[in-house]
């Protein structure tokens, strides 16, 4: 779901699932801004004190990243300018499951949306012909 209104921008997330031990994607899009330096992306997680990830002024800002996500997160930096705030999560762990918030600040305003992320050992269904 997203939020909108005065001094707000629309942020949209999609619930997703990650396979333990593999890389996962937490999807988030927002109304783009014309200047990359005006965009701040923050990912937060329920139950975690620090940030999952922060991207501002065109680069990752790691000082407030929570230790449980250190070295495991990245945004698609070249796609931020077109409104893609999705997070790549490396080496998905069982404890990564939970409620995440994608929080965006641009020159147009602020917005955020929650995302439920499930983790497990999923496999592609076999189709017998």
């Amino acid at each position: 779901f997203g939020i909108s209104g005065r001094h707000s921008i629309t942020v949209t997330t999609v619930a997703s699932a990650g396979n333990i031990g593999e890389d996962g994607i937490l999807s988030c899009t927002f109304e783009p801004d014309i200047k990359l330096s005006d965009i701040v992306i923050q990912w937060l997680k329920e139950g975690v004190l620090g940030l999952v990830h922060e991207f501002k002024e065109g680069k990752d800002e790691l000082s407030e990243q929570d230790e449980m996500f250190r070295g495991r997160t990245a945004v698609f930096a070249d796609q931020v300018i077109v409104g893609n705030a999705s997070l790549r999560l490396k080496n998905v762990q069982l404890t990564d499951a939970g409620t995440y918030k994608c929080y965006i600040i641009t020159s147009k305003g602020k917005g955020n949306a929650n995302l439920e992320y499930k983790t497990g050992a999923f496999s592609m269904p076999e189709v017998n012909v």
């Epitope: 975690v48 620090g50 407030e64 929570d66 409620t99 929080y103």
Partner: antibody, heavy 116, light 113 residues
Framework: QVQLVQSGAEVKKPGSSVKVSCKAS????????ITWVRQAPGQGLEWIGG????????KYAQKFQGRVTITADESTSTAYMELSSLRSEDTAVYYC?????????WGQGTLVTVSS | DIVMTQSPDSLAVSLGERATINCKSS????????????LAWYQQKPGQPPKLLIY???TRESGVPDRFSGSGSGTDFTLTISSLQAEDVAVYYC?????????FGQGTKVEIK
């Protein structure tokens, strides 16, 4: 600019509780954790704990577990630190700060004196 | 939990001379994932909150004079004031932010000789 304004000095009796407030402005309150640190007279800095305001997730130092409660009110951009069962050793200046790791911005401090 | 130990506890240096403060962590604060040391230095003057001077062990906070520098990696770190000024009289703390609980050194008091 980032500002953290704390409530005024308190004098408390042993066994009682104190609740210190910290009003944040100049940044997005829900984006960053608020940390609480204390400093006894003439002593060093001691981490008490912190809170993620958007989800209300709090973490406490083991030493204070069961005696401290850190909360945050998103509507007023205010964080609170309540310490119960006060003893004389809790006499200290209590600081709130923006962030949970690297602390660039601090409140002015609140002196809590515990005396009978 | 990580324990931070500073030396010396106090230091008297003549104006214009070099002051050196050491900080040792009980375990490494160097992250292999980004090759950064999660170590900061703060200055505290009487009646004031601490002020951030250095982070990532060697990056100066904006507005901090270049006479302040930080060095070291892993478990051993140093804060150097290259030419002590009267306004540098204060207590200096190192802090690890590699993991919670956050831990500070016990502080080093710098005075003028």
């Amino acid at each position: 600019q980032v500002q953290l304004v704390q409530s005024g000095a308190e004098v408390k009796k042993p066994g009682s509780s104190v609740k210190v407030s910290c009003k944040a402005s100049g940044y997005s309150f829900i984006s960053y954790a608020i940390t609480w640190v204390r400093q006894a007279p003439g002593q060093g800095l001691e981490w008490i704990g912190g809170i993620n305001p958007i989800f209300g997730t709090a973490k406490y130092a083991q030493k204070f577990q069961g005696r401290v409660t850190i909360t945050a009110d998103e509507s007023t951009s205010t964080a609170y630190m309540e310490l119960s069962s006060l003893r004389s050793e809790d006499t200290a200046v209590y600081y709130c700060a923006k962030g949970q790791a690297l602390i660039q911005h601090w409140g002015q401090g609140t002196l809590v004196t515990v005396s009978s | 939990d990580i324990v931070m130990t500073q030396s010396p506890d106090s230091l008297a240096v003549s104006l214009g001379e070099r002051a050196t403060i050491n900080c040792k962590s009980s375990q490494s604060v160097l992250s292999s994932s980004n090759n950064k040391n999660y170590l900061a230095w703060y200055q505290q003057k009487p009646g004031q909150p601490p002020k951030l001077l250095i982070y990532w062990a060697s990056t100066r906070e904006s507005g901090v004079p270049d006479r302040f520098s930080g060095s070291g990696s892993g478990t051993d770190f140093t804060l150097t004031i290259s030419s002590l000024q009267a306004e540098d009289v204060a207590v200096y703390y190192c802090q690890q932010y590699y993991s919670t609980p956050l831990a500070f050194g016990q502080g080093t008091k710098v005075e003028i000789k």
